[in-house]
Amino acid sequence: KFSKQSWGLENEALIVRCPRQGKSSYIVDWYYSQTNKSIPTQERNRVFASGQLLKFLPAEVADSGIYTCIVRSPTFNRTGYANVTIYKKQPDCNVPDYLMYSTVSGSEKNSKIYCPTIDLYNWTAPLEWFKNCQALQGSRYKAHKSFLVIDNVMTDDAGDYTCKFIHNENGANYSVTATRSFTVKDEQGFSRFPVIRAPAHNETKEVEIGENTNLTCSACFGKGAQFLAAVQWQLNGNKITDFSEPRIQQEEGQNQSFSDGLACVNTVLRIADVKEEDLLLRYDCLALNLHGLRRHTIRLSRKNPIDHQS
């Protein structure tokens, strides 16, 4: 359950944290998983355990493997696994995918690139930064604490950024590098033909007679403020207001903005005390903006009583 991938380059320092947390006062035992042999805590060893941290100073390709950490808390022991891979140094500038940390996105307003894993190390400023292996120079680039700030970000600032720093352990210095991709987001808003997120077209929803049910119509229309964006439900092609059934009510549309920045609108159709005749109706989710109209249809079906029992 608690396994974490870690990687590094030969002849560089690598420090790995136990994937199971605990207070700093708790004893953590580290083992080579394959042999169950305990990892020493003495700092004179090239590979040694230091509480929640496992240190390779420096790392060798042969260190690759799975390491077990057991956190000894006052109640129960907790086990984690660190899957460590040490790679040979690349002869050329190209950084392979398997050495890349998570991609970060920036924009004109926010262009911080954090140096991955740096908080595990004993380092001192300043960090060195490289883009596609070239040292970054010029007033647009500011190395600040553990991150790089780029002024007036442009689309061609996208690329692979490497931070390089020195880890100090008992007076000995070890080099560490870490690379991640940076992409540039365009913050301009736009409008597009509606995309209905829910329901799926020609979906069938199982309901129980006598119970209440809700149908959500959710559609997205682009990014940023939209001039026109509407969602609504229709019954058999008629507006809800034209359908004289007080059990069936449509909520007012709710604006939503998702993590991907899309401007979306939701409306919920509430059906109280579902009746047999409701199963015969066609429920249409309509999404409309200046680009046009999109319709998804959903029907209701009776929940299978055998399924319900199980």
Partner: antibody
């Protein structure tokens, strides 16, 4: 399938003794702590204590220390909770729950169905 | 004993609503906190362990966060089958202790 099956409901008089059981199956019974949780009528959950069937090591909540005995018989993969002298205030639902191994733990991940104990004169 | 204070003690929300329950420990418990769901007449069920890890088979609408003394449990979109009482529980120290529970109802 990993499961804990508890003994049936009990109706007792104050002062009587009682032993309820919890049988584990589908996993290595001796490698996991088994504990007991009390739920009085309409109330929340209270942790009572645990036993490690591998070596019969036990831990108790101070509230229940000396009030109950927790034991296990690994030959029949069963844990027990017992009272030597019941009180009306022991009326409750009692659940057994698995508490992880000697080296790993992820919460109380498997529960018995519960045993209702009613103590009334 | 470590006291676990859960709030609110009960709440009523509509289907589709986001529901948040908080749990506060009387001392630092790192991330040693679990969340359970108990439906009426049933045994409790583990939903989240170590503050934020979803137990296998539990729907992704359930989530947990927090560390130290303050923890949060969230149901991103309440479903009718989520009607239950939810408990937090610390396992940093013996005795293990539970919060008082939060009863979740549908409006």
């Amino acid at each position: 399938e990993v499961q804990l099956v508890q003994s049936g409901a009990e109706v007792k008089k104050p002062g009587e003794s009682l032993k309820i059981s919890c049988k584990g199956s589908g996993y290595s019974f001796t490698n996991y702590w088994i504990g007991w949780v009390r739920q009085m009528p309409g109330k929340g959950l209270e942790w009572m204590g645990i036993i490690y069937p591998g070596n019969s090591d036990t831990r108790f909540s101070p509230s229940f220390q000396g009030q109950v005995t927790i034991s296990a018989d690994k030959s029949i993969t069963t844990a027990y909770l017992q009272w030597s002298s019941l009180k009306a205030s022991d009326t409750a639902m009692y659940y057994c729950a698995r508490h992880g191994t000697s080296s790993d733990y992820y919460g109380l991940d498997v529960w018995g169905q519960g045993t209702t104990v009613t103590v009334s004169s | 004993d470590i006291q676990m204070t859960q709030s609110p003690s009960s709440l009523s929300a509509s289907v589709g609503d986001r529901v948040t329950i908080t749990c506060q420990a009387s001392q630092d418990i790192s991330n040693y906190l679990n969340w359970y769901q108990q439906k009426p007449g049933k045994a409790p069920k583990l939903l989240i362990y170590d503050a934020s890890n979803l137990e296998t088979g539990v729907p992704s609408r359930f989530s947990g966060s927090g560390s130290g003394t303050d923890f949060t449990f969230t149901i991103s979109s309440l479903q009718p089958e989520d009607i239950a009482t939810y408990y937090c529980q610390q396992d940093d120290n013996f005795p293990l202790t539970f919060g008082g529970g939060t009863k979740v109802e549908i409006k």
